[in-house]
Interface confidence: low
């Protein structure tokens, strides 16, 4: 019996036309939301005039759908066992499941201030980057509705900039009608023990942002894994939202719908210092933000967002170390909240929940030249906003995998 | 390697006008974007005008706006600065920088750039 039903996983596990995967992987069967909270900055004038802690509320969530539009330029490559695909960005405002609307306004960082200073550090450069600053107006902080901070504003001091430039931000532009990829993964014809595991991203097996083995492309992109999941296995997954690969771990055993699931977790090690786990040294870019790569709990991904220096970390900077977090008031990180599983069915691979959780922060350095952050006396990681994008397996679906899999192993 | 070499510097009365030019040598001129500055004896070093690559957008400092225009010849390479109305404050060395950095996003000016000797402009009133 238990044979049959391997090879009967086996076959349906496979990604290609007619089989269980292969239909749910193009377009996914699950509501995937995206919830987002703001950090709204409480005392923007005392931070900027005395240097003092950030004082933050978040308010939230504001929900968006996510993850709704198929797959796009599927084509599969019988010569390597490979099926590559765009994955296309898409939102929408989920008005009943949000705290308020797209026209709510936040004081928060001004992004342009801050991305420019750091990028331009030379002295004469910042002489005229304080000089267009002054005449736009423009602050260490500004304040701008959510629509504007998500999906992207005209800026008024980069619009003053003499050069060909982007003028257009917002940290999540552009999002709507553009796409993730192209992905190269493997379809597990010749080999199931690779199915969905990444082959190559955007044409390479590497990344180009960290050094060593910090820049491979590992395993699958976590909406699947290779059938027949042992509690045991460190589950090795890229995420293209934080330019790296990571990994989860076994946690506890659930029940989700009547569905035996493994529970996977990101643990406190994956973000942990060198000196904590001597395997994060190459994701330690820097010695002066980073004390000489004895903070954690941060991922400087500047290299991956042309230069501007983003910061990624688990909301409220769950396991991050104290001094990343001291000039920030009004944090509260906890694990329940604000962590990062995947429920994965063991026999298919498939992942039927998953709650991925992570914080943006920009980081802000004191600068002489530049008048509205000349007062500051340290650097500050300030937290901008927070997400947790949620999937759960519908009831129809579950019902259905309950019968024709679970089902016949019990 | 870049060379930039400055020239219309000279003596003026109040009033008057002058034509600085810059040639540069060494690089594809027009992949970049050029800038004037200036500075007066016991000051620092200051932001004057700037040009882009395509010569399409330009950007003055408020005590020369209305008064300098600043303009490229790609086919040249030389970027200039028509500088009219001059008043005695105006009087300084005047410096153009080109950016070795630019890559065609975000503000190009990375790093400290290459400059040219100087040519100094005096104002009499």
């Known amino acids: 019996g238990d044979l049959l039903i391997q090879k009967t996983i086996k076959k349906q596990v496979v990604l290609e036309e007619g089989t269980i995967a292969f239909k749910n992987w193009v377009k996914t069967g699950t509501e995937v939301y995206r919830q987002f909270w703001i950090f709204d900055v409480q005392n923007p004038q005392e931070v900027m005039m005395n240097s003092s802690n950030i004082q933050v509320k978040q308010r939230g969530p504001y929900t968006y759908r996510v993850r709704f539009l198929a797959k796009e330029n599927v084509t599969q490559d019988a010569e390597d066992n490979t099926v590559s695909f765009l994955q296309p960005n898409g939102a929408i405002f989920e008005p009943s499941l949000s705290v308020g609307t797209e026209a709510d306004n936040f004081t928060v960082l001004n992004l342009a201030v801050a991305a420019a200073s750091h990028i331009y550090q030379n002295q004469f450069v910042q002489m005229i980057l304080n000089s267009l600053i002054n005449k736009s107006k423009s602050s260490m902080f500004q304040v701008r509705t959510l629509r504007e901070l998500l999906w992207g504003y005209r800026d008024p001091f980069l619009s003053l900039v003499p050069y060909p430039v982007t003028t257009t931000v917002g940290l999540f532009y552009p999002y709507n009608n553009t796409a993730d990829g192209v992905y190269k993964v493997f379809n597990g014809k010749d080999n199931i023990s690779k199915v969905a595991i990444i082959d190559t991203y955007k044409g390479k097996r590497n990344l180009s942002y960290w050094e060593s083995h910090c820049d491979m492309i590992n395993g699958t992109d976590a909406a699947s894994f290779p059938p027949f999941v042992e509690k045991s296995q460190v589950l090795q997954f890229f995420s293209s939202d934080i330019c790296r690969s990571i990994y989860a771990v076994f946690e506890s055993d659930v029940n989700l719908k009547g569905i035996p699931v493994y529970r996977f977790v990101l643990p406190s090690k994956a973000f942990a210092s060198p000196v904590e786990n001597p395997d994060n040294y190459c994701f330690c870019t820097e010695k002066i933000i980073s004390k000489n790569c004895t903070s954690y709990g941060v991922l400087d991904i500047s290299k991956c967002k042309e230069g501007r220096p983003v910061y990624i970390s688990l909301p409220h900077f769950l396991y991050a170390s104290p001094d990343v977090s001291e000039p920030i008031d009004g944090l509260n990180p906890n694990e329940e909240e604000h962590r990062t599983y995947l429920d994965i069915e063991p026999i298919t691979g498939f992942t039927l929940q998953f709650a991925k959780r992570l914080q943006v922060n920009l980081l802000v350095k004191p600068s002489e030249k530049i008048q509205v952050l000349k007062n500051l006396k340290r650097n500050y990681i300030v937290p901008i906003l927070w997400l947790n994008e949620t999937g759960t397996i519908g009831d129809e679906k579950a019902n259905m995998f309950r019968s024709q899999v679970t089902g016949k192993i019990n | 390697q870049v060379q930039l070499q400055e020239s219309g510097g000279g003596l003026v009365q109040a009033g008057g006008s002058l034509r600085l030019s810059c040639a540069a040598s060494g690089r594809t001129f027009s992949s970049y974007a050029m800038g004037w500055f200036r500075q007066a004896p016991g000051k620092e070093r200051e932001f004057v005008a700037a040009?882009?690559?395509?010569?399409?957008?330009?950007y003055y400092d408020d005590p020369v706006k209305g008064r300098f225009t600043i303009s490229r010849d790609n086919a040249k390479n030389t970027v200039y600065l028509q500088m009219n109305s001059l008043k005695p404050e105006d009087t300084a060395v005047y410096y153009c920088n080109l950016d070795p950095e630019y890559s065609g996003t975000w503000n190009p000016w990375a790093g400290s750039g290459y400059w040219g000797q100087g040519t100094q402009v005096t104002v009499s009133s």
């Open positions: 040009i882009s690559w395509s010569g399409g957008r330009t």
